[in-house]
Every structure is written in structure tokens, then in C-alpha cells.
């Protein structure tokens, strides 16, 4: 999404959530 937009995209599955969690946790260590 570009800055200034309203983003309403829904993920059809929870599978990709694992990748998001992983990325979020990786940021913690920065």
C-alpha cells in the first residue's frame, strides 16, 4: 500500500500470518 491510502485487503488464510509474525519478531532484535 502506498502512503495516503486506505488499505482494506484481507488475507484469505492464516498461513502467511506465520511469516508476518516471524518478520515482526526479527525486528525486535534490531
Amino acid at each position: 500500500s502506498s502512503t495516503g491510502s486506505i488499505d482494506m485487503v484481507d488475507s484469505p488464510q492464516l498461513a502467511t500470518l506465520a511469516d508476518e509474525v516471524s518478520a515482526s519478531l526479527a525486528k525486535q532484535g534490531l
Partner: antibody, heavy 116, light 111 residues
């Protein structure tokens, strides 16, 4: 510094839609995920869903039919909408940076009561 | 009903070592190091202590540590302080439910 603040009505009538907004500062809702968590009085926290940094939205399957999460990048806001509320939806609603296992900064929370 | 099981209460004396367990399944705790631990004082928002099962969050004293083995995660406080008295929750990614919290543990510090 990183901050999140929930806003919205503190009282909602049964069968109506609960709408809350989380306004963030100190980070970008584009590059970081924002989760919504609620906690009924005296109960355990419950994960509602999240707006991922990818732009995808993720929902608690038990609530997915009633729940909608949207992200407005221009206002640094993530909003939550919960339809057809009942008294069981009375809780403190939190937004927080992260998704579930590493939610590092939380809003103060907003107590929403569902009552006629 | 919480998917992750914790003891409802634990207690220990000042300076004592205590551990809180969080038992789940292969779809959550056993899925990987996607586990966090939170401390909550009544009336306040949860505070992140441990992320990624074993990493201490910024500013958290080193007396707090976390580990995971199979479907069980453990939070250990090596030397109890009076200010540690609070409720503790584990939380995990769940491949079916998205995100789940534990049943919660009330920690009481004695004496």
C-alpha cells in the same frame, strides 16, 4: 517515542456495530504490524486480529464473520469494526504494535460496554 | 476458554526462583519460537517480557528468561522481587486460530 491510542465510544447498544480507531505515532503502520486484543473484566486477553505490515489483515476465526480491520496510512490509523455486538463483547480493547508473540508497545486500552 | 494452559497461581519468597509453564500443542507452542510472555498489573495494559520464546524485550531485567521445549514454553524468574507480583500470560501464534493467549498465572511474592 512509540505510542498508540485507542478512541471510540465507550457505550454501544446490543446488535449495533462497535467501531474503534487506533492512532499511532513514532512508527509507521506501513512498516509495522498493529494488533487488536480485548480483555473482558477479570478474563484472559483475546487476540482479535491484526493489520500486517504486508497490508494483509488477519482475524480470529471465531470472530471473522463480525470483524473488519482497516488501515489508513495517511492518518497513521488502524481501525476495528465489530458488528452485531452482545453483552459478551464488553471488554477493554487494546491496540498494540506487533502481532501476537512480540507485541512490544500497547495502547492504554478503552473500556467498551455493551448495554441497552 | 484459553487454548494454552498455565497454572492458575504460583508463589515464592523474595529472592526465590520460580517458573511458569505454558502448555499447548503442535499448532501453537510446538509450531516454533513464536511465543511471547506478558506481565500485567491489574488496571494496566500487558507488558512484553519475552518474545520469540527466549529473547528478553528491551528494558526487561535479566532475572526474567524464557525457553521452549516441544509443546511447552517456560518463563523463569531467577530471583523474585516484590514488584514481580502480577498476572503473567503466554501468547503464541496458532496455525488454526491466528493468535492465542494462555489461561494466565497469578504470581504472589511472599514475605
Amino acid at each position: 517515542q512509540v505510542q498508540l491510542q485507542e478512541s471510540g465510544p465507550s457505550l454501544v447498544k446490543p446488535s449495533q456495530t462497535l467501531s474503534l480507531t487506533c492512532t499511532v505515532s513514532g512508527f509507521s503502520v506501513i512498516s509495522d504490524s498493529v494488533a487488536w486484543v480485548r480483555q473482558a473484566p477479570g478474563k484472559v486477553p483475546e487476540w482479535l486480529g491484526a493489520s500486517g505490515s504486508s497490508g494483509n489483515k488477519y482475524y480470529n476465526p471465531a470472530l471473522k464473520s463480525r470483524l473488519s480491520i482497516t488501515r489508513d496510512t495517511s492518518k497513521s490509523q488502524v481501525s476495528l469494526s465489530l458488528s452485531s455486538v452482545t453483552t459478551e463483547d464488553t471488554a477493554v480493547y487494546y491496540c498494540a504494535r506487533g502481532i501476537i508473540a512480540g507485541v512490544d508497545v500497547w495502547g492504554r486500552g478503552l473500556l467498551v460496554s455493551v448495554s441497552s | 476458554q484459553a487454548v494454552l494452559t498455565q497454572p492458575s497461581s504460583v508463589s515464592g519468597a523474595l529472592g526465590q526462583r520460580v517458573s511458569i509453564t505454558c502448555s499447548g500443542s503442535s499448532s501453537n507452542v510446538g509450531y516454533g519460537d513464536y511465543v511471547g510472555w506478558y506481565q500485567q498489573v491489574p488496571g494496566s495494559a500487558p507488558k512484553l517480557l519475552i518474545y520469540g520464546a527466549a529473547s528478553r524485550a528491551s528494558g526487561v531485567p535479566d532475572r526474567f528468561s524464557g525457553s521452549r521445549s516441544g509443546n511447552t514454553a517456560t518463563l523463569t524468574i531467577s530471583s523474585l522481587q516484590a514488584e514481580d507480583e502480577a498476572d503473567y500470560y503466554c501468547a503464541s501464534y496458532d496455525s488454526s486460530d491466528g493468535g492465542v493467549f494462555g489461561s494466565g498465572t497469578r504470581l504472589t511474592v511472599l514475605g
